[in-house]
Structure formats: C-alpha cells, structure tokens
C-alpha cells in the first residue's frame, strides 16, 4: 500500500494516526470521527489546547494518545463527549496541571502523564491520590513536579475539598409552612456552588438566594411529600467537589389502611400506615389487644427510601377458626390517630357447639383510644416477601 500523505492516516479498522510533524493545531474535522475507537497523535507542537468542541462526535473513542506535542491546557469538560474513554496518554507535552473534573465521569484504566512539566499544587491532589491508591497505572510513572521533586512528596495538608454546613429549622415544620435552608461553604479556592433539588418535584415552591460563601434556599408552602426527599448543597474547588444532603421533616397526622387477608405460605393481613413522626402501632383482635408472638406478628416490607408510608402484614402462621374475627390496626402520632378494621376468616369452626375452644394467642382488654405501641419506623425491618420467612 502506498504511504498515506495526509496529516492523519487510518490505522486498523477504527483507528487514526496523526504523526506528520506540525500538521495539526486542533482536532476539528477529523475524518471518520464518529466511528473512531483509537486516536494516536504525535509530534504536533501546534496542538496546544484540548477543549470540549475538539472531541465532539468522537462518542466511540476508547483510546486517546497525544504525545510529544505542545499540549498546554486540557479543558475540564474536554472529554464530555467521549464517555467510553478508558486509556488516555498525554505524556511528553507541556501540561503544568490537569483538573480533577477532566477525568471525572470517565472509567480510566490508564492515565499517562509522564514527561510533563507538572506544577505541584492542590489542583493535583487528586492525581497524588491516584498514585497513593494505585489507580490508572499512575504509580509506575513516578511523576515529578517541575523543579519540585516527586508528586508523591507534595505537601497536601491544606488541600481539602470545600466544607459545607447546611442549617435546617429546629422547630417542627407543618404542611403549608415556608422553610429557609442555608448552606455555609468554607474552603480555599472556591469555584462554584449550588443546590440539587431533583427529588423535590411538587413538594414545595423553590426560591434560591445568595451566593458563595452562603447560599439560601426557601421552600415555600411545603407538602407532606417533602418528607424523605434529599435537598443537596454542593460546592467545588480545585481539589474536588463536596455535597451535603439534608431532609426536612414535615409533620402530618397518622393514617392507616387495611386490606383483605391473603394466603401465601402463611396468612397476611396487608396494611399501610403513614404519618410524620412515624406513628406507633397497635393491633386489636375482637376489641382486645393482640399480643404478638412468633405465630402472629407485624412484619414490614422494606421501606422505600423516599417516602414515609410503610407497608406490611399482620403475619399469621397456621391460623385456625379461633383466629377468625375482627382485626383493627390503631396508628397514632402527636398530630392525630387513625384506625382501620377488617373481618378475617381463616377456617370454619369444626366445633360449632363449643364456643370455649382454647385460643392459641394471648389477648388483654384495651381502651381503643390507646396510642401506645411500637414505633413503625424502624431502621432494620423485616424484608419479608423476598424469601419465605416463618416466625
């Protein structure tokens, strides 16, 4: 095959090599860019900047090599359009620094930066961490900072990401209230900060105020849906990014629903309870307190992380006719109480003539307005239904 006279020549089925001295000053309009998986560039002293627009359309790129060239600056978002990039070799260029944002979001198996006049500063703390943690083949390169010695020896005591403190109201928040949150940002070289409110949806009307170092956020006319939703403050500096999430607890009264008993491996009387704070629960059987045992007990589904409602079962193992009757679930919190009842029949009574048949669970009388009981919200509730679990 005749030698390729162009600045860039095909290499294999989806590669491109650009090695003719000084032929490139940018990477615009590379031939066949959309299918490239490998791009090799060498001896391009006029190629000094790598920016977002340079790699647009190179969505399939896996390996990028730019060596022995004049690269001085790589934009933080340069690789936004190359999410599949796994090998990046920028050795023997004129790079003094490289932002942590440049490699964020990439799954780099290899990052080569040897032979660059790196300048040791907090902006390279992320690279020093890669070296410490053995990532991307960095330790083997024994990177040096120009005139400053090994990168590994760079002092890093003052190289921290921003520190965030989010102030939330101490007092109880009710439905319809306005809530002011404040995010206090501290740290060196602060660049950007803001709020992430993607979970809020219709939970409140949002108004942002202020800027670095103190960001304000007003959540107006809050609803009970705001519970369990993350409100996140974030900030960035040259070392990295910090995020802190908080949740606002909006008080609302207890509510409860009961459903018809269903037979699984065991019997289940399904229920749902809601309220903030989490309501206490109590079961009654024919008007008397039902004392839980391994034969009849409350079992909760794994809670959804972003809602207050809890679903579960009154679990009945081996119920007989003596368990037939009226089941009532009482739920109460400081803002109100609720109850729901359902009739359940598990088995016909084979001894209709004997109403004194023994009952295999213990009961005691109760005032139906009672609000004591176990709190619903427990950190480690039974994930039943995932496996068959009995008692």
């Amino acid at each position: 095959a005749a030698p390729c006279p162009d600045a860039c020549c095909p290499h294999g089925s989806s590669g491109l090599r650009c090695t003719r001295d000084g032929a490139l000053d940018s990477l615009h309009h590379l031939p066949g860019a959309e299918n490239l998986t490998e791009l090799y560039i060498e001896n391009q002293q006029h190629l000094q900047h790598l920016e977002l627009r340079d790699l647009r359309g190179l969505g399939e790129l896996r390996n990028l090599t730019i060596v022995k060239s004049g690269l001085r600056f790589v934009a933080p978002d340069a690789f936004h359009f190359t999410p599949r990039l796994s090998r990046l070799n920028l050795s023997f260029n004129a790079l003094e620094s490289l932002s942590w944002k440049t490699v964020q979001g990439l799954s780099l198996q290899e990052l080569v930066l040897s032979g660059n006049p790196l300048h040791c500063s907090c902006a390279l703390r992320w690279l020093q961490r890669w070296e410490e943690e053995g990532l991307g083949g960095v330790p083997e390169q024994k990177l040096q900072c120009h005139g400053q010695g090994p990168l590994a020896h760079m002092p890093n005591a003052s190289c921290g990401v921003p520190t965030l403190k989010v102030q939330v109201p101490n007092a109880s928040v009710d439905v319809g209230d306005d809530v002011l949150l404040r995010c206090q940002v501290e740290g060196r070289g602060l660049e950007q900060a803001g709020w992430i409110l993607t979970e809020l949806e219709q939970s409140a009307t949002v108004m942002k105020s202020g800027g670095l170092p103190s960001l304000g956020l007003t959540l107006a006319n809050v609803t009970s849906d705001l519970n369990r939703k993350n409100v996140t403050c974030w900030a960035e500096n040259d070392v990295g990014r910090a995020e802190v999430s908080v949740q606002v607890n909006v008080s609302f009264p207890a509510s409860v629903q009961l459903h018809t008993a269903v037979e699984m491996h065991h019997w289940c009387i399904p229920f749902s309870v809601d309220g903030q704070p989490a309501p206490s629960l109590r079961w009654l059987f024919n008007g008397s307190v039902l004392n839980e045992t391994s034969f009849i007990f409350t079992e909760f589904l794994e809670p959804a992380a972003n809602e207050t409602v809890r679903h579960g079962c009154l679990r009945l193992n081996q119920p007989t006719h003596v368990n037939n009757g009226n089941y009532t679930l009482l739920a109460a919190n400081p803002f109100g109480q609720a109850s729901a009842s359902i009739m359940a029949a598990f088995m016909d009574n084979p001894f209709e003539f004997n109403p004194e048949d023994p009952i295999p669970v213990s009961f005691s009388p109760v005032d139906t307005n009672s609000t004591s009981g176990d709190p619903v919200e427990k950190k480690d509730e039974t994930p039943f239904g995932v496996s068959v679990a009995v008692g």
């Epitope: 491996h265 007990f297 023994p358 213990s362 509730e381 995932v386 679990a389 008692g391």
Partner: antibody, heavy 118, light 107 residues
Framework: QVQLQQPGAELVKPGASVKLSCKAS????????MHWVKQRPGQGLEWIGE????????NYDEKFKTKATLTIDKSSRTAYIQLSSLTSEDSAVYYC???????????WGQGTLVTVSA | DIQMTQSPASLSATVGETVTITCRAS??????VAWYQQKQGKSPQLLVH???TLAEGVPSRFSGSGSGTQFSLKINGLHPEDFGSYYC?????????FGAGTKLELK
C-alpha cells in the same frame, strides 16, 4: 447455610448470673424469631421463650419469666439469654433455635452447657 | 397450656424392626405437631412437622401421622443410626411444649 453458634460451656457459682450468646449467620436475621430451649442432663426439652429480632419483643413460658431475660444485638446478629439467681436446678444445656419455612425448629445451635457449682 | 403426653418412655428394638412412638395432646391441636430425634451430646434434629410432613433430608423410613389429639411417629425398618431419643412438640401457639421423650435403645 444457616448456622447458630453457641459457646460450649459456662461454669458459674450459685446465686450468680450468666449471659449466653447465640450468633446467627446464613439467613436474614430479622426475618425469624429466636427461641431458647433448656435441657437438664438426661431430661427432656423445655421451651423458655422467644424474641423478635426486629423490635426486641419477647414472650416467655410462665416458668421462666423471672429466671430468663432474652435480648438481641442486631448489629452483631447475636441473640442472648441471661439467667439470674442461679441454682443447681439451672444446670443444663441451653439451646437457641429458629423455625425453618414452617413453624418447627429446623435449626438449632450446638447448645451451651451451664454448670452451677460452688 | 397444652400438655403433650408421649409414650413409651423407653423402647428396646433391633435393627430392621419397625417401631411406633405416640403422643397425645391435652386438646385439639389440628395437625400442628413436630417430631425430633436427638443423639447423645448433640442438638435435636427435626424429623417431621405438621404431623406428617418429612423435614428436608429425612429418610423415608420415618413417617408421621395423626391429627386432633392423637399423633404417632413410625420408623419402618430401624437402621443403626436411628437409636437415640425422640421428642414430640406441638406448634399450635405459645407456650410451645414438648413430650417427655422416648429413649429408643438397641435390644
């Protein structure tokens, strides 16, 4: 596989207390009540009580209400039984046990032999 | 509380023989009975639950029967490893109670 690990033996003095452990593995600890069973040398099995690992709720046989206290440490997946005011009558093997897919003891610990002796 | 009366207290038999152990409940417990085998110095092993359902891995020479108040465990053709103690237990609410046990010895 399901395992309930218990220490082999405890020697205690009359009048003292002892706390026995049962470390669970191989299943969802919070999905099953834990039970304790006593067996005196050459004698039969006696059910002491049960505990719900989710909330610490307990039920005891009347006979053991003042003798035994059941507790749970969810973080270490361990159930405990504390026996108080020990006498020679409390010398026995103490088993922890759990139900399988039915309400019967499909899984047992190896048992801890408690000897009460001056 | 439900009492479980087990008989006989002891039983001598030879390898290959068929034996039956019985248990009487003090009240109707439907079919909520389990049977356990225990060897000297070992933990009990579940043989049967719900009166007649064999537990996993239990040989078919073991069988349970009965309902209401009368229950039995039958071993068809004893093997050498079958000698030991056997206990019935009701699983019909708490407190759970066991029979006093049957010691099966080699004649």
């Amino acid at each position: 596989q399901v395992q309930l690990q218990q220490p082999g033996a405890e020697l205690v003095k009359p009048g003292a207390s002892v706390k026995l452990s049962c470390k669970a593995s191989g299943y969802t600890f919070t999905s099953y009540w834990m039970h304790w069973v006593k067996q005196r040398p050459g004698q039969g099995l006696e059910w002491i009580g049960e505990i719900n690992p989710n909330n610490g709720l307990t039920n005891y046989d009347e006979k053991f209400k003042t003798k035994a206290t059941l507790t749970i440490d969810k973080s270490s997946r361990t159930a405990y039984i504390q026996l108080s005011s020990l006498t020679s009558e409390d010398s026995a093997v103490y088993y922890c046990a759990k139900y399988g897919n039915y309400v019967a003891f499909a899984f047992w610990g190896q048992g801890t032999l408690v000897t009460v002796s001056a | 509380d439900i009492q479980m009366t087990q008989s006989p207290a002891s039983l001598s038999a030879t390898v290959g023989e068929t034996v039956t152990i019985t248990c009487r409940a003090s009240e109707n417990i439907y079919s909520y009975v389990a049977w356990y085998q225990q060897k000297q110095g070992k933990s009990p092993q579940l043989l049967v639950h719900n009166a007649k359902t064999l537990a996993e891995g239990v040989p078919s020479r073991f069988s349970g029967s009965g309902s209401g108040t009368q229950f039995s465990l039958k071993i068809n053709g004893l093997h050498p490893e079958d000698f030991g103690s056997y206990y019935c237990q009701h699983h019909y609410g708490i407190p759970l109670t066991f029979g006093a046990g049957t010691k099966l010895e080699l004649k």
